[in-house]
C-alpha cells in the first residue's frame, strides 16, 4: 500500500505522458488522477514505465473501479494486464473480441497463464457459446486450447466453428474429446466431396464410429498409419481385413511395423489368420483356421 502524500507543487499530471516515467512511486500515486489515467489508458503502453510504476497505476485503477474495470479501460491495459490476478479478471465483463485479442497479444509467446485462462472463461461464458470467430482467435494464440476443454464444454461448440480448427489444434485431444468433436465435424463438412471431405475430417477421426470407417473404406481415401493408429479401438475391431486394406490403400504395408501396438494388435487378434495372410505382410496372431468365432456381444443383444 502506497502512502497518501500531497503532490509536490507543479507536478500534478495534466495528461498521461512520458514525463511520468521520471516520477517516483509516491509522486505517481499523489499526482496522477485515476480518472485521467482511465480516460488515457491507451497512452500507457507507449510509455516505458517500470514494473514498480505499473503497480502504482494498477492500484489507482483498482481504487477507481472496485467492482471491476470497464471494457474501455480493459482494452487498453497492454502490459498492465500481466499485473492482474485471476480475482481481478473475474470482476470484468469482456464482450469485444478486439479486447480479447489485445490482451492475448500481450501474453503471446508464453504458456496460458491463470490470468489468460480466467479471461477466456469470462469471455466465452459471456458469449454463451464458442462461436467461430472466438475459436479462430483462441486457437491462433493457443493451438492446444480446444483440447484443454472438457467434453461438456466442447458440446457448446457449434458445428460452424469447426471450420476454424486446424489439425495441430487437436494434437493433444483425448478420445472423449474427439467423440464430441467428430459428429460436429461430420455435420460441418457434410457437403464436401469425397477427397476434400477426407482431408478436413481426417484429424477428427479419433472419434469416428465403425460404420463411418466402413463408409470411408469404400472411397479410396488412403488413410495414413498415423491417423489409423489414433482411431478408437472399438471402432477398428469390427473392420474386416478387406475393409482395412481399402481404408489404408498403399499404406497397408505399415501395419507390420505396428502389429504390437493398439489398435492394430487388438484388430489382428480378431481376424482369421488366412484373411491376414492375404495381405502378404507376415502378420501373425490371427484366429487359426478351423476355429469358430462366436460374437458374444451379438449373442447378448439377442437374448
Amino acid at each position: 500500500e502506497v502512502e497518501k502524500t500531497a503532490c509536490p507543487s507543479g507536478k500534478k499530471a495534466r495528461e498521461i505522458d512520458e514525463s511520468l516515467i521520471f516520477y517516483k512511486k509516491w509522486e505517481l500515486e499523489a499526482c496522477v488522477d485515476a480518472a485521467l489515467l482511465a480516460t488515457q489508458m491507451d497512452r500507457v503502453n507507449a510509455i516505458p514505465f517500470t514494473y514498480e510504476q505499473l503497480d502504482v497505476l494498477k492500484h489507482k485503477l483498482d481504487e477507481l473501479y472496485p467492482q471491476g474495470y470497464p471494457e474501455s479501460v480493459i482494452q487498453h491495459l497492454g502490459y498492465l494486464f500481466l499485473k492482474m490476478s485471476p480475482e481481478d479478471i473475474r470482476k470484468w465483463n469482456v464482450t469485444s473480441l478486439e479486447t480479447l485479442k489485445a490482451l492475448l497479444e500481450v501474453n503471446k509467446g508464453h504458456e496460458m497463464s491463470p490470468q489468460v485462462a480466467t479471461l477466456i472463461d469470462r469471455f466465452v461464458k459471456g458469449r454463451g457459446q464458442l462461436d467461430k470467430d472466438t475459436l479462430d482467435t483462441l486457437t491462433a494464440f493457443y493451438p492446444g486450447y480446444l483440447c484443454s476443454l472438457s467434453p461438456e464444454e466442447l458440446s457448446s461448440v457449434p458445428p460452424s466453428s469447426i471450420w476454424a480448427v486446424r489439425p495441430q489444434d487437436l494434437d493433444t485431444c483425448d478420445p472423449r474429446q474427439l467423440d464430441v468433436l467428430y459428429p460436429k465435424a461430420r455435420l460441418a463438412f457434410q457437403n464436401m466431396n469425397g477427397s476434400e471431405y477426407f482431408v478436413k475430417i481426417q484429424s477428427f477421426l479419433g472419434g469416428a464410429p465403425t460404420e463411418d470407417l466402413k463408409a470411408l473404406s469404400q472411397q479410396n481415401v488412403s488413410m495414413d498409419l498415423a491417423t489409423f493408429m489414433k482411431l478408437r479401438t472399438d471402432a477398428v475391431l469390427p473392420l474386416t481385413v478387406a475393409e482395412v486394406q481399402k481404408l489404408l490403400g498403399p499404406h497397408v504395408e505399415g501395419l507390420k511395423a505396428e502389429e504390437r501396438h493398439r489398435p492394430v494388435r487388438d484388430w489382428i487378434l480378431r481376424q482369421r489368420q488366412d484373411d491376414l495372410d492375404t495381405l502378404g505382410l507376415g502378420l501373425q496372431g490371427g484366429i487359426p483356421n478351423g476355429y469358430l468365432v462366436l460374437d458374444l456381444s451379438m449373442q447378448e443383444a439377442l437374448s
Epitope: 512520458e18 514525463s19 521520471f22 507507449a46 503471446k108
Partner: antibody, heavy 115, light 109 residues
C-alpha cells in the same frame, strides 16, 4: 502533426565542437523525450542520449559521457546536441527523434569531421 | 551500452513471411517490454514500425508484427513486398537509456 526540423550540414575540424539543433512543431514539446541518434556512413544506429524538456534532465550513453551535451529550450520548442573533441570517426548523420519510442524523426544532419 | 544481436541479413521472396530476431539479455529485452523496431530505406531517416514489443503505430501495415520470448524479440513481416526491402533495427529501452541492435538488411528476391 509532429514535425522535427534539424539544422543544416556541418564540416568541422578534429578537436572542435559541433552544435546541432532540432525544432519541434505539433504536440506538446515539454513532456516528450527528445533523443539523439547517430549513424556513421554504412553503419548502424547508435543512441547518444535524450532529454525530457519539462525537467531539463538529460541522460547520456556511456560512450559519449563527458563529450556530449543535450539541452532543450521550451520557449522555442528546440532541442540541441553539442558534441565536443571531434574526431574523424564522429563523421555521421545525426538524427533527433521524439518520444521514448522514437516515434518521430528529424531529417538528419550530416556532420563531417575532416582536417 | 552493449548492442543487441541481429542477423546481418535475411531474404525472402514476394508473398513469403520472414522473421528477424533480436537477442539481448535478461536485464534488457528479458526484463522490460519496451522493444521497438525501425525500418530504414537508403538515405532516409528511420521509421518506427513496432513499439512495446507488439504494438503498431497507426499507418503501419498489419503485415508487420512483433513478439518476444525470453531474451529474444522478433519482427515478422508477412506477405513480403518489394518496398519492404530495407534495413531493420531493433532497440530496447532500459530506463533511462536505449540500445540498438546492429541492424539487419532485408532483401526481397
Amino acid at each position: 502533426q509532429v514535425q522535427l526540423v534539424q539544422s543544416g550540414a556541418e564540416v568541422k575540424k578534429p578537436g572542435s565542437s559541433v552544435k546541432v539543433s532540432c525544432k519541434a512543431s505539433g504536440g506538446t514539446f515539454s513532456s516528450h523525450a527528445i533523443s539523439w541518434v547517430r549513424q556513421a556512413p554504412g553503419q548502424g544506429l547508435e543512441w547518444m542520449g535524450n532529454i525530457m524538456p519539462i525537467f531539463g534532465v538529460a541522460n547520456y550513453a556511456q560512450k559519449f559521457q563527458g563529450r556530449v551535451t543535450i539541452t532543450a529550450d521550451e520557449s522555442t520548442s528546440t532541442a540541441y546536441m553539442e558534441l565536443s573533441s571531434l574526431r574523424s570517426e564522429d563523421t555521421a548523420v545525426y538524427y533527433c527523434a521524439r518520444e521514448m519510442r522514437l516515434a518521430y524523426w528529424g531529417q538528419g544532419t550530416l556532420v563531417t569531421v575532416s582536417s | 551500452d552493449i548492442a543487441l544481436t541481429q542477423p546481418a541479413s535475411v531474404s525472402g521472396s514476394p508473398g513469403q513471411s520472414i522473421t528477424i530476431s533480436c537477442t539481448g539479455t535478461s536485464s534488457d529485452i528479458g526484463h522490460f517490454n519496451y522493444v521497438s523496431w525501425y525500418q530504414q530505406h537508403p538515405g532516409k531517416a528511420p521509421k518506427l514500425m513496432i513499439y512495446s514489443v507488439i504494438s503498431r503505430p497507426s499507418g503501419v501495415s498489419n503485415r508487420f508484427s512483433g513478439s518476444k520470448s525470453g531474451n529474444t524479440a522478433s519482427l515478422t513481416i508477412s506477405g513480403l513486398q518489394a518496398e519492404d526491402e530495407a534495413d531493420y533495427y531493433c532497440a530496447s529501452f532500459t530506463f533511462p537509456s536505449l540500445v540498438f541492435g546492429g541492424g539487419t538488411k532485408l532483401t526481397v528476391l
